[in-house]
């Protein structure tokens, strides 16, 4: 038998301690929210909010402008001044809870924890490739806001998620806020609402539709809104909330809420429980049937998938999939599985399950004892009755009321437990060529860029590197601008190339040339690198013979 070179073990073919320097910006305080803007004339910006300040950065993370958003009551607060002479309410720091783009006349909308959670609209001013903000407009009309009914009170100090949808020419703000008794009593934000921005930007139209946790449940039943997004005909919110109203706070689980993006009403509000599990290939004795549950969503992102993953998920290439990072939760006992798992929920399948759930509730024969659910939002009732009614009403349709779908959607960890002890705190998924890549931030300040594939028993890394020495957790919000992602950790914002920061972590030529084509890696004498880093010969096709 011919002699062969010994194989290099897979783990020895890469070094994740290689240092990569990526562009960064020091914000001067803990980054609270971040959003990017890409205009149609090559102008772009990164907006970064910290306590009492909003930074406008160029795509290169150089500072362009900075705006004081607090403290409320301070003469230096530039946004507060837009509301005219005060006082406007209690003074205090402004934590930015919402930072979204209003598409119509492109503008940035920011909403903070101060001044009853009101918002400000900043027109965008492109100057060359940079973007500036105009003086803010105060989205608050004193005469139509009262403590018990406040259309212009948007942000909750406990957290708010907003997705903006254009319907016709109007901009509708789909808002989801975490509440407790104290917050609910102060200028009455709602749990879920759809608010129309008035054409004259004088605030939001009164008489908006909303759902709120009922007063009797406010103390025990809290909902955390983790993520929101718009795709197709719907807006989706992802929540972590108690599994049971009666046992609240109790065990937590994750739900997807679906709202119509074409009709600003909540009659077709639907919720579905998302179930993510770790199912090891070989089940240990005593391990739960169907896998170990990971009920608590940490972060989520939806994206169209590449051909390879689409095939594994039995869906078409380019279809939208919701990816979630789940953890076991505090009361799950000593688990033997990984710290984080990643589950994939195809949107079309989610919609089908929801629609089937509506049929089960509303089409005869209705299974006796099937509950409409959402008892924290509405009076208890059985299908097909409207909330609070003992029998169906002839004038009302069963479908025109909120519903919790009776079945859950169960998936298993895409990574088969291979994330191990890694605690994922941020997630952004991209499609590159026919490959789907998960860009993940971790609790110890690292970035993992990993190919998403179900069938492998190892992780296909694009990169795994540390953002710096602080080791602070990477925050939940991730934004994209062109070929870069922007991650925040502590008081810093980092710009990470989608195709990875480099190739130097691949130590062998074989491993280097097996890297995904989109990474642009090639063998360069005695190291793996990109062509522009390589003054000499650069080879992407074959390795020099080993001597």
């Amino acid at each position: 038998k011919e002699w062969q070179c010994p194989r290099t073990p897979y783990a020895a073919s890469r070094d994740f301690n290689v240092k990569y320097m990526v562009p960064s910006f020091s914000a001067g305080g803990l980054v609270q929210t971040m959003v990017t803007y890409q205009g149609d004339k090559n102008e772009s910006a990164v907006f970064v909010a910290i306590r009492n300040r909003l930074h406008v950065l160029g795509p290169d993370l150089k500072s362009v402008q900075s705006l004081a958003t607090g403290p409320a009551g301070d003469p230096g607060c530039q946004t507060c001044a837009a509301c005219g002479p005060g006082p406007h309410g209690p003074s205090g720091d402004t934590d930015t809870k919402v930072l979204v783009l209003e598409p119509a006349l492109p503008a940035l909308v920011s909403c903070g924890s101060s001044l009853q959670g009101r918002c400000f609209l900043h027109d965008l001013d492109p100057q060359g490739t940079a973007v500036h903000l105009a003086a803010p407009a105060c989205l608050f009309s004193a005469h139509h806001n009262r403590p018990d009914d406040c259309p212009d009170c948007v942000a909750s100090p406990l957290g708010t998620r907003v997705t903006v949808v254009e319907q016709g020419q109007a901009s509708y703000f789909y808002v989801a806020s975490s509440l407790d008794a104290a917050v609910a009593a102060s200028f009455s934000p709602r749990s879920v609402s759809i608010r129309r921005l008035k054409a004259d930007a004088s605030g939001f139209a009164p008489g908006f539709v909303a759902l709120s946790v009922l007063p009797k449940h406010l103390v025990s039943y809290s909902i955390e809104y983790v993520h929101s997004f718009h795709t197709g005909a719907f807006v989706y919110f992802l929540t972590v909330q108690p599994a049971s109203v009666t046992d609240a706070p109790g065990a937590l689980h994750t739900r997807l809420a679906r709202l119509s993006a074409t009709e600003p009403e909540l009659g077709d509000y639907r919720e579905l429980v998302l179930d993510c599990r770790f199912a090891p290939k070989r089940r240990r004795r005593g391990a739960p049937e169907g896998g170990q549950p990971y009920p608590v969503l940490r972060v989520a992102h939806s994206a169209p998938v590449g051909a390879q993953l689409a095939t594994e998920l039995s869906i078409a290439e380019g279809q939208e999939v919701l990816f979630g990072v789940f953890v076991a939760g505090k009361d799950s006992g000593p688990g033997v599985g990984p710290n984080s798992v990643v589950c994939a929920f195809p949107i079309d399948l989610l919609d089908t399950l929801i629609d089937e759930g509506v049929e089960r509730c509303c089409e005869s024969p209705v299974h006796p004892g099937l509950r409409r659910g959402l008892d924290f939002f509405q009076s208890p009732s059985f299908c097909p009755n409207p909330p609070g009614l003992e029998a169906p009403s002839p004038n009302t349709s069963c479908r025109h009321f909120p519903l919790l779908v009776s079945s859950s959607f169960s998936r298993v960890d895409l990574f088969n437990g291979l994330l191990g002890t890694v605690e994922v705190t941020a997630l952004y998924v991209t499609r590159l060529d026919n490959v789907t890549v998960a860009h993940m931030g971790t609790a110890d300040g690292r970035i993992l860029q990993v190919e998403l594939a179900r069938s492998l028993n190892y992780l296909l890394y694009v990169s795994n590197f540390s953002l710096g020495d602080s080791g602070q957790p990477v925050q939940r919000d991730v934004s994209r601008l062109g070929d870069h992602l922007f991650f925040a950790s502590g008081d810093q914002v980092f710009q990470v190339p989608i195709q990875g920061p480099g190739c130097r972590h691949f130590l062998t030529c074989g491993r280097c040339l097996r890297a995904q084509r989109f990474m642009g890696c090639g063998w360069c004498g005695n190291m793996c690198g990109r062509q522009k880093e390589c003054p000499g010969s650069w080879q992407q096709d074959h390795c020099p013979p080993k001597l």
Partner: antibody, heavy 120, light 107 residues
């Protein structure tokens, strides 16, 4: 003193296109959106659309989409409205009016109007 | 689209009288209504903004009121220079819309 100076009256043939200008002075041109309003001979006022000179963003009345195109030239503080494929229905006086799109403001200054007559 | 209905179409009053113009919106628009005066061969001129807010340079005899769907413009002592058409305009929703106008005549 705030002024909006519009171009003069025009007589144009059916099927042709034409451009009306509105030159702003006496204020920061990019600070206000520019609105365009049509007044037919029946005295009816119709809002055509607006442009934000700040960033070129536009919002149109659906009724005038495809009929009117709004642009600005920041360097000369001038707003333009091009009217396409003119018919007799487009004969009217067209006004430009500035508006600060935020609570507390309305269309506070108007141009003198540009009369357009479409006739063969 | 929000329809604004102005009534009456023509108002005829004597100098010194008080006069009121009505504007009704097809749906609630808060106070996002503005009033304009247009004299013969002139451009519209802003009189009142946001239902009741006065405009500098506009005589104090002009005032506005209302919210929701019903709005009123009043001239508390009409003068001959007030002969004009009066229009209401809403800025609550796109597209912005105007009422058909009320013509003021002085006897």
């Amino acid at each position: 003193e705030v002024q909006l100076q519009q171009s003069g009256p025009e007589l144009v043939k059916p099927g042709a296109s034409m451009k009306i200008s509105c030159k702003a002075s006496g204020y920061s041109f990019t600070g206000y959106t520019m609105n365009w309003v049509k007044q037919s001979h029946g005295k009816k006022l119709e809002w055509i659309g607006l442009i934000n000179p700040y960033n070129g963003g536009t919002i149109y009345n659906q009724k005038f989409k495809g009929k009117a195109t709004l642009t600005v030239d920041k360097s000369s503080s001038t707003a333009y409205m091009e009217l396409l494929s003119l018919t007799s229905e487009d004969s009217a006086v067209y006004y430009c009016a500035r508006w600060l799109r935020r609570g507390g403001y309305a269309m506070d200054y108007w141009g003198q109007g540009a009369s357009v007559t479409v006739s063969s | 689209d929000i329809l604004l209905t102005q009534s009456p179409a023509i108002l005829s009053v004597s100098p010194g009288e008080r006069v009121s113009f009505s504007c009704r919106a097809s749906q609630s628009i808060g106070t996002s209504i503005h009033w304009y005066q247009q004299r013969t061969n002139g451009s519209p001129r802003l009189l009142i903004k946001f239902a009741s807010e006065s405009i500098s340079g506009i005589p104090s005899r002009f005032s506005g009121s209302g919210s929701g769907t019903d709005f009123t413009l009043s001239i508390n002592s009409v003068e001959s220079e007030d002969i004009a058409d009066y229009y209401c305009q809403q800025s609550d929703s796109w597209p912005l819309t105007f009422g058909a106008g009320t013509k003021l005549e002085v006897k």
